[in-house]
């Protein structure tokens, strides 16, 4: 509600901000507090008590004085008063200081992302022209989560050297379209890297990786746990041999046997033969009988 | 940590023009903007004129309106503030302080006097 224009007490005309302006009623804010010091003071704002109506009759004064959008200066030093911002106030800002994120999404820590934060991290990103590691190191600390927050199309803007920066947790609500377009940037990123280090930093990202490359990684003796190998592609283990998946998982393979009947194990184990499942000696059952014929209807389907 | 330096103060005779130069150094995007205060003797500090950290707001006490105006750059990590103070009146004689959150400069003396 617009707050009635009435004219400032003698005497009570705002000289600065400070707390004596806490004791101000909502009218003698608007009448007796000058908008333009109010921005050039906004570093003062957090450290007053001040009510969330006070709080709105201050943004009611910030908005007056700029109806095209906050400029940062001020946008840095909203404090409590970003929580009292729209999605519509946020779009119209030009946010480009990552100090300036920090400071907001600091504002707003431990709560679930809301739709101003989410804009924000819009507006910031869309500036910005990508998702460059020191954002994707904040957002993440700030929201574990970020990462999987994230289309596939609005991931494909992440350049592979932001990938240092994500960590296993940020990866742990990401699906297998979302791995899709990681992983090859993981690849890339971690691409110098040697054997067992190339593994630890690849691990997370395997969800969106090729069968080939599951296959390269099975002669590399890398010991893959079972909650990794269970995230994999349904798609890209069932080429994979029994042997293959025996070097993959190494001392880990006895895992199967307790997830036989979930994927990927029970559709891969339907495409080994039975004979190559008991070398595992795992007791694991459902392969393709002895004697039987492996026709590969995809091969079929491709040559007519 | 903001290190604020100020300068430019001096003796001018009533009418004259001077102009203060307020030097902030350290975190000072930790600021949303800086501050001239006026601490003549005996009484209490005046806020005379601030300015957004981004120049794009400024404001002034009712007794320097029109007659002084603050800008501000930045140079080599640093931000500049200046107050240019034209029509000086022998009341405007004061220490002239420059401040930032819980910064202060130490001061520079400006007297109007014939």
């Known amino acids: 509600r617009e707050v009635e224009k009435t004219a400032c007490p003698s005497g009570k005309k705002a000289r600065e901000i400070d707390e004596s302006l806490i004791f101000y009623k909502k009218w003698e804010l608007e009448a007796c507090v000058d908008a333009a010091l109010l921005a050039t003071q906004m570093d003062r704002v957090n450290a007053i008590p001040f009510t969330y109506e006070q709080l709105d009759v201050l943004k009611h004064k910030l908005d007056e004085l700029y109806p095209q959008g906050y400029p940062e200066s001020v946008i840095q030093h909203l404090g409590y008063l970003f929580l009292k911002m729209s999605p519509e106030d946020i779009r119209k800002w030009n946010v480009t200081s990552l100090e300036t994120l920090k400071a907001l999404l600091e504002v707003n820590k431990g709560h679930e992302m809301s739709p101003q934060v989410a804009t924000l991290i819009d507006r910031f990103v869309k500036g910005r022209g990508q998702l460059d590691k020191d954002t994707l190191d904040t957002l993440t600390a700030f929201y574990p989560g970020y990462l999987c927050s994230l289309s596939p199309e609005e991931l494909s803007s992440v350049p592979p050297s932001s990938i240092w920066a994500v960590r296993p947790q940020d990866l742990d609500t990401c699906d297998p379209r979302q791995l899709d377009v990681l992983y090859p940037k993981a690849r890339l990123a971690f691409q110098n890297m040697n054997g067992s280090e190339y593994f630890v930093k690849i691990q997370s990202f395997l969800g969106g990786a090729p069968t080939e490359d599951l296959k390269a990684l099975s002669q590399q003796n890398v010991s893959m746990d079972l909650a990794t190998f269970m995230k994999l592609r349904t798609d890209a283990v069932l080429p994979l041999t029994v042997a293959e998946v025996q070097k993959l998982l190494g001392p880990h393979v006895e895992g199967l046997k307790a997830e036989e009947r979930h994927r990927p194990v029970r559709d891969w184990i339907l495409r080994q033969r039975q004979d190559d499942l008991d070398t595992l000696g795992l007791g694991l059952q459902g392969g393709i009988p002895n004697g039987y014929l492996v026709l590969d209807l995809s091969m079929q389907e491709a040559l007519s | 940590q903001v290190k604020l330096e100020e300068s430019g103060g001096g003796l001018v005779q009533p009418g004259g023009s001077l102009r203060l130069s307020c030097t902030a150094s350290g975190s000072i995007w930790s600021a949303s903007g800086l501050t001239w205060y006026r601490q003549r003797p005996g009484n209490e500090r005046e806020l005379v004129a601030s300015?957004?950290?981004?120049?794009?707001?400024?404001?002034?006490a009712d007794s320097v309106k029109g007659r002084f105006t603050i800008s501000i750059s930045r140079d080599n990590g640093k931000m500049i503030t200046y107050l240019q103070m034209n029509s000086l009146k022998p009341e405007d004689t004061a220490v002239y302080l420059c401040?930032?959150?819980?910064?202060w400069g130490q001061g520079t003396q400006v007297t109007v006097s014939s």
């Open positions: 401040n930032s959150r819980s910064y």
């Open positions: 300015i957004t950290t981004g120049g794009e707001t400024t404001w002034y």
